[in-house]
Amino acid sequence: VPEKSVRWCAVSEHEATKCQSFRDHMKSVLPSNGPSVACVKKASHLDCIRAIAANEADAVTLDAGLVYDAYLAPNNLKPVVAEFYGSKEDPQTFYYAVAVVKKDSDFQMNQLRGRKSCHTGLGRSAGWNIPIGLLYCDLPEPRKPLEKAVANFFSGSCVPCADGTDFPQLCQLCPGCGCSTLNQYFSYSGAFKCLKDGAGDVAFVKHSTIFENLANKADRDQYELLCLDNTRKSVDEYKDCHLARVPSHTVVARSVGGKEDLIWELLNQAQEHFGKDKSKEFQLFSSPHGKDLLFKDSAHGFLKVPPRMDAKMYLGYEYITAIRNLREGTCPEAPTDECKPVKWCALSHHERLKCDEWSVNSAGKIECESAETTEDCIAKIMNGEADAMSLDGGFVYIAGMCGLVPVLAENYNTPNPNCENTAEEGYFAVAVVKSSSDLTWDNLKGKKSCHTAVGRTAGWNIPMGLLYSKINHCRFDEFFSEGCAPGSEKNSSLCKLCMGPSPNLCEPNNKEGYYGYTGAFRCLVEKGDVAFVKHQTVPQNTGGKNPDAWAKNLKEEDYELLCLDGSRKSVQEPANCHLARAPNHAVVARKDKADCVQTLLLDQQRMFGSSVTDCSSNFCLFESKTKDLLFRDDTVCLAKLHDRNTYEKYLGEEYVKAVTNLRKCSTSPLLEACTF
């Protein structure tokens, strides 16, 4: 197989014919050293998936349900290119499966038992697989056959294409369960009509269905969406209130050696030459000998799936939960309203040790999951492999963009017993220099910089945001002569100053000696000119408070703060000499786990929080000898957020704006994936 050949998998004679035409037309427009198409014919999409996994083919386009099959072991395929619909300016690559109800009804998602339901059709994604998959564990036992369990759950339904003889209740609202438009309640518009006519109480459809059927906003306002957290939202808030986000049609490839760049190069060229309204002789998104051959006829083009986006992230936690429930038919033994153990995400092995000790002391109420970077931990929380972790504000922003929510804030200044109910204003992000140097905020160019990590508040977002507005470009590695900013590209000058050890050099976790607040300060002490940290860092690591060899003899008066007006002040005056106020670190979780995480953590801190005085012979949640493991060591308590329960409200408008501006310079692959 030539290096630059993409072997496309076709699943019928008609697809194979179109594939050959695709191959021939691409040959005519691409240079001889460009990508080429070869065609491989298989009997089914599942056979194509297996062929790609076995390196007998390279690519195929799949519906969401098959993307799930492709991702499962031993296939391990991943999404590489997505079809989009709508316009190039506003490309739609996903749709949202929603539960629509009338505004004047008064039930929530957890009160659907005994209601009347309207479905698009048996076995269809938005109308059946997703809602029934998510409700699966609430269905009466035995749950097989599924249709019988659903019939016994709702008091009556319309499920087009169901067997009305065996399951008459599923056809109660549409006698005969007709499987075509002859049934007035068939498909998306039909299911919505079933609700509109008053036959059913809830309709399971796509987010766009209501807009396609009700042009008038006043009419739409008579309806609401049921959210998974047992609240309701208006129909235009579907991005924040849906059952699942479903990818429309996706090209998949091998996770390793999958030729994803070549596939993108090929499809990008293909859409330029043979996309919508591009060519008369061959059209990529048209199927003269059938329907949706190789690609959907309704597609308008392709978008490259960000490299950080694996199948789990692409399909989403809700979709995978629904499909897994349906396929595997397993439900937890515990009632669903009881909190299961919370899986904490620990960064690298130092945090894992502390988490393990916490787990033992919590009698298993806390379990531990590990990842090498904060972004990997956030991804694990998104896909359900972990449940929660505490994050710096910069990562609260990324987590929020990825659909996670803040649950509790770390408080640093409020003494107990008021701590748990107090919303603190935040801490100061400062620039620290040695008293002996002549540095000011205005002459940092060419100096050596020390940062907590890329993407963190005090160490990166605030100082680099301020710097960006001064220099108007993102080449921070050219502004400083060298530095240590863990998480930077390994060959960047901003990794040059890092201490490692070697394989962990510049990694954004505690294996890198200059990571975090203490690490950045150590970098200043040993090699750097300026450290970007929190205002408490110098006092916490001087005067013998940090017993480590590098810190035990340090004096607070040997360090000063840089003020934005070009002056310098004592480290005792952060209120009058700081770069900005930073939001406190916060615990984040998935929405569905937020209440359990909050309840458990408040309970845990009563046992292991700052009320424990002897940490040498007791487990202390907020102690790790200046290393800020799992939580900042200066945490007094975890505090309730009250109404600051979204990332925007928690971080505040000003900080969100600053980080959004800095996104031009973003090196966050996760943020790129979450905003796809």
Partner: nanobody, 117 residues
Framework: EVQLVECGGGLVQPGGSLRLSCAAS????????MAWYRQAPGQQRELVAG???????KYADSVKGRFTISRDNAKNTLYLQMNSLKPEDTAVYYC???????????WGQGTQVTVSS
């Protein structure tokens, strides 16, 4: 600082039993949490079982019902009773008391357990 020395490992057939001991050089009465970890070739070190001073225990899912952790403060010893051993239990087993903080790498020699027919 208390030193810990593991022993009791060996070669055992699937279904067999072993009892690991971890002897401390000083008093463990004031040590809150003690634990057994294991590391198989090419794998990360993982928590097998832990016990607090008050006797609260936690086990990895893979060993629940087969392994039992206990401590004898009078003898300054931590134990791990391993029954119904499986080939996948093959690893070097280490004990720790977390008392040196989480940051230093302070593992002892460990004791090798091999489960094979």
């Amino acid at each position: 600082e208390v030193q810990l020395v593991e022993c009791g490992g060996g070669l055992v057939q699937p279904g067999g039993s072993l009892r690991l001991s971890c002897a401390a050089s000083g008093s463990i009465a004031s040590i809150n949490t003690m634990a057994w970890y294991r590391q198989a070739p090419g794998q990360q070190r993982e928590l097998v079982a832990g016990i607090t001073r008050g006797g609260s225990t936690k086990y990895a899912d893979s060993v629940k019902g087969r392994f039992t952790i206990s401590r004898d403060n009078a003898k300054n010893t931590l134990y791990l009773q391993m029954n119904s051993l499986k080939p996948e239990d093959t690893a070097v087993y280490y004990c720790t008391d977390y008392s040196r903080g989480y940051y230093q790498d302070y593992w002892g020699q460990g004791t090798q357990v091999t489960v094979s027919s």
